[in-house]
Interface confidence: low
């Protein structure tokens, strides 16, 4: 807490400017008045300040707005913003996707800081939901942004919020998330042309159940190592030896390389070996010929 | 059929405010942005923004921030042209056209309405 | 803001000649998805402006193949093979992929 004290004569503060800088904090406290602080938030970021000083300039502000700071001011705090709290920062009401920029853009190279989380928290519940440029901007700043929300907080994700999304965004999501957002790309990519379409879906497959991945193998699409050993167990076990050698088209050899590893070892195991062989690739495990194979969850279902 | 049915012309006087409606059919109105479109008599085509009528929210070009605002009826499908504090200037045809705004990547404005003129006069 | 500069501001042409309008950019326009947006529309008196080119070169359906659009970069051009009388009118350049989207000013096209 600064102590209260008069203002020295003639060092009252007009305008926010760089001759505040040689002002100690117990000056700054008593010859800045905290609304001419917030009117001039935009010129205190020009200005090096030190942390000490910052402490006080944000001791005025809290003053001025015990229940929170307007936008107006929110949109300007510039390196005052990294002085917040996320308790502080709960009290806001950020609405404007320009005040989230420029408080992201302060904070930018650096991790998600828990100010950050909060203020993204803050912004998105605000709007109702992550709408296309809102993601497009927090992508930009945080790529591993969508993986680090919930499934539930995905499924207020609008698909035309998932043109903003790039391969790399999606890196670190796991299963269940892809399981809501593949849906979601689905839907927004549905008018493209088949090449076209597969790139922009190809990095959220990983939700993809079986019958899309049968009706992309009839389209020619290549489908690379990588992108297969990250699509779901359950969606690739149904597939038959013709149509995995269809979606993978050239790179079906890989297959080989990959035959511990799941998928490609739960599939081996369920395809017969003798329509393995057709690959030519080596690949062992399959069922052998003259065996029966029985679907026991059809048998479940019937039971 | 597709299209975007306007509302009719208009006479205002300088202050006024008018209210242009673009009502759409034969197709799902929240898939398609709202875009308005300013044309001032013999003049060219000047693009105002955009309405995403998913989320609703609106974008403006530089020139019509402030007294223009885009709004939408969703339910109705139908989306609004409001100019505030008329002036001179404003007198045009204002046109509504959809285009795009994701799902493809072959965005462009289709389908236009046929325009409604706003005159204003004192 | 990306300023599209279209030239001539008027082509006279007579019928069945070839006509050839320009459209220059201040500034490439790719949007983040790898597509450029260049569309060109025609207003005929009166009427609403139609959709003729989508992404530079792409026809619209409906649209006469004596159309066509080329050009990369900051220069795009729109050529009609053979000008027929419903051809007339005024043609304008667009971009869409950089907001705020931008018009050319216009080319009128009449008869010489």
């Known amino acids: 807490e600064v102590e209260k004290t008069a203002c020295p004569s003639g060092k009252k503060a007009r305008e926010i400017d760089e001759s505040l800088i040689f002002y100690k904090k117990w000056e700054l406290e008593a010859c800045v008045d905290a609304a001419l602080l917030a009117t001039q938030m935009d010129r205190v970021n020009a200005i090096p300040f030190t942390y000490e000083q910052l402490d006080v300039l944000k001791h005025k502000l809290d003053e001025l707005y015990p229940q929170g700071y307007p936008e107006s001011v929110i949109q300007h705090l510039g390196y005052l913003f990294l002085k917040m709290s996320p308790e502080d920062i709960r009290k806001w009401n950020v609405t404007s996707l320009e005040t989230l920029k420029a408080l992201l853009e302060v904070n930018k190279g650096h991790e998600m800081s828990p100010q950050v989380a909060t203020l993204i928290d803050r912004f998105v519940k605000g709007r109702g939901q992550l709408d296309k440029d809102t993601l497009d901007t927090l992508t930009a700043f945080y790529p591993g942004y969508l993986c680090s929300l919930s499934p539930e907080e995905l499924s207020s994700v609008p698909p035309s919020s998932i043109w903003a999304v790039r391969p790399q965004d999606l890196d670190t999501c796991d299963p269940r998330q892809l399981d809501v957002l593949y849906p979601k790309a689905r839907l927004a990519f549905q008018n493209m042309n088949g090449s076209e379409y597969f790139v922009k879906i190809q990095s959220f497959l990983g939700g993809a159940p079986t019958e899309d991945l049968k009706a992309l193998s009839q389209q020619n699409v290549s489908m690379d190592l990588a992108t297969f050993m990250k699509l779901r167990t359950d969606a690739v076990l149904p597939l038959t030896v013709a149509e995995v050698q269809k979606l993978l088209g050239p790179h079906v050899e890989g297959l080989k390389a990959e035959e511990r590893h799941r998928p490609v070892r739960d599939w081996i195991l369920r395809q017969r070996q003798d329509d393995l062989d057709t690959l030519g690739l080596g690949l062992q495990g399959g069922i052998p010929n003259g065996y029966l194979v029985l679907d026991l969850s059809m048998q479940e279902a019937l039971s | 059929q597709i299209q975007l049915v306007q509302s009719g012309p208009e006479l205002k006087k300088p202050g006024e405010t008018v209210k242009i409606s673009c009502k759409a059919s034969?197709?799902?109105?929240?898939?398609?942005?709202m875009n308005w479109v300013k044309q001032a008599p013999g003049k060219g085509l000047k693009w105002m923004g955009w309405i995403n009528t998913y989320t609703g929210e609106p974008s403006y070009a530089d020139d019509f921030k402030g007294r223009f605002a885009f709004s939408l009826e969703t339910s109705a499908s139908t989306a609004y042209l409001q100019i505030n504090n008329l002036k001179n200037e404003d007198m045009a045809t204002y046109f509504c056209?959809?285009?795009?705004?994701?799902?493809?990547?072959?965005?462009?404005?289709?389908?236009w309405g046929a325009g409604t003129t706003v005159t204003v006069s004192s | 803001d990306v300023l599209m500069t279209q030239t001539p501001l008027s082509l006279p042409v007579s019928l069945g000649d070839q006509a050839s309008i320009s459209c220059r950019s201040s500034q490439s326009f790719v949007h983040s998805n790898g597509n450029t947006y260049l569309e060109w529309y025609l207003q005929k008196p009166g009427q609403s402006p139609k959709l003729l080119i989508y992404?530079?070169?792409n026809r619209f359906s409906g649209v006469p193949d004596r159309f066509s659009g080329s050009g990369s970069g900051t220069d795009f051009t729109l050529k009609i093979s053979r000008v027929e009388a419903e051809d007339l009118g005024f043609y304008y350049c667009?971009?869409?992929?950089?907001?705020?989207?931008?018009f050319g000013g216009g080319t009128k096209l009449e008869i010489k």
């Open positions: 992404k530079v070169s």
């Open positions: 034969g197709y799902t109105f929240t898939h398609y942005g």
């Open positions: 667009f971009q869409g992929s950089h907001v705020p989207y931008t």
């Open positions: 056209a959809r285009r795009r705004d994701y799902g493809t990547s072959h965005w462009y404005l289709d389908v």
